[in-house]
């Protein structure tokens, strides 16, 4: 499919936080497309020159992934068709904190949204009954 003459699509992200050493989720949703092969998902991080993750034609395309994310990223491939572009980030590092962009291309158009991702040693709040 060609890029020219397309409309913009709505892409929505939610700021989130990740616990160092654990797995985290960077949330992103978009207006779904009926054909998986027409969907491209790119995750980018400000200040990082390689990609965080790319998913296109129904599979991961990681040749241009930045080495700092090697082996640590995945999308929920079975949920892309319904508009879920969220990224699973394994073994969260302090250096993973920053501004991420979720960039989507479909046959309907393209769009993007930024999210702030914080990292740290967060503990679950105790609830006293």
């Amino acid at each position: 499919f060609g890029i020219s003459g397309r409309h913009s699509i709505t892409v929505t992200t939610v700021a989130s936080a990740g616990n160092i050493g654990e797995d985290g989720i960077l949330s992103c949703t978009f207006e779904p497309d009926i054909k998986l092969s027409d969907i491209v998902i790119q995750w980018l991080k400000e200040g990082v020159l390689g990609l965080v993750h790319e998913f296109k034609e129904g599979k991961d395309e990681l040749s241009e992934q930045d080495e700092m994310f090697r082996g640590r990223t995945a999308v929920f491939a079975d949920q892309v068709i319904v508009g879920n572009a969220s990224l699973r980030l394994k073994n969260v590092q302090l250096t993973d904190a920053g501004t991420y962009k979720c960039y989507i291309i479909t046959s309907k158009g393209k769009g993007n949204a930024n999210l702030e991702y914080k990292t740290g040693a967060f503990s679950m709040p105790e609830v006293n009954v």
Partner: antibody, heavy 116, light 106 residues
């Protein structure tokens, strides 16, 4: 077209420092990393490190840590590689190369000769 | 550091021959392997990236492999192909190179 042009050959004495430049043109300078690779006479290729032209952040080969410094000047789209405390085994052709996960193109190379 | 073991270190071949060069990584590097060609007195030139993707080179060059074992093949050697070839891993820094394979005229 994308081009990397390096500074000219240098002859240095042991213990001295050398600074090699690499001027980029034909692309957005801050869009890709710049790497340095060296090749001693008749030998293979040795990865020296890289610089992120956007942030100035660097990653160096462990064996050169403390002796190598990579910097950049975004106003002139130029990166620099400085190697200090030179020894005879640093005699090599030094290349800059652009990339993320593969190097293309490469500079023409700068011969640095270390000799007393 | 990841070691890249390239073989053979040199080979003699004739124009028209099929030439195969192999590279073995010391750990799994997926398909993060590149191949370069270098001629005497010149800078290396990218041939293949991501193990099998041709850069701006003739189709007689091909690359294959994933994990730890990789191959560069020249299906029909041409006079301009006599050079030294290097593999490189780009899985993690330092992006180490193989020792090189010099392809000489028989």
């Amino acid at each position: 077209q994308v081009q990397l042009v390096q500074s000219g050959a240098e002859v240095k004495k042991p213990g001295a420092s050398v600074k090699v430049s690499c001027k980029a043109s034909g692309y957005t300078f801050t869009a890709q990393y710049m790497y340095w690779v060296r090749q001693a006479p008749g030998q293979g290729l040795e990865w020296m490190g890289r610089i992120n032209p956007t942030s100035g952040n660097t990653v160096y080969a462990q064996k050169l840590q403390g002796r190598v410094t990579m910097t950049r000047d975004t106003s002139t789209s130029t990166v620099y590689m400085e190697l200090s405390s030179l020894r005879s085994e640093d005699t090599a052709v030094y290349y800059c190369a652009r990339g993320i996960n593969w190097f293309d193109p490469w500079g023409q190379g700068t011969l640095v000769t270390v000799s007393s | 550091d990841i070691q890249m073991t390239q073989s053979p270190s040199s080979l003699s071949a004739s124009v028209g021959d099929r030439v195969t060069i192999t590279c073995r990584a010391s750990q799994n590097i997926d398909t993060y392997v590149n191949w370069y060609q270098q001629k005497p007195g010149k800078a290396p030139k990218l041939l293949i990236y991501a193990a099998s993707r041709l850069h701006t080179v003739p189709s007689r060059f091909s690359g294959s492999g994933s994990g730890t074992d990789f191959t560069l093949t020249i299906s029909s050697l041409q006079p301009e192909d006599f050079a030294t070839y290097y593999c490189q891993q780009s899985y993690t820094s330092p992006f180490t190179f193989g020792g090189g394979t010099k392809v000489e005229i028989k």
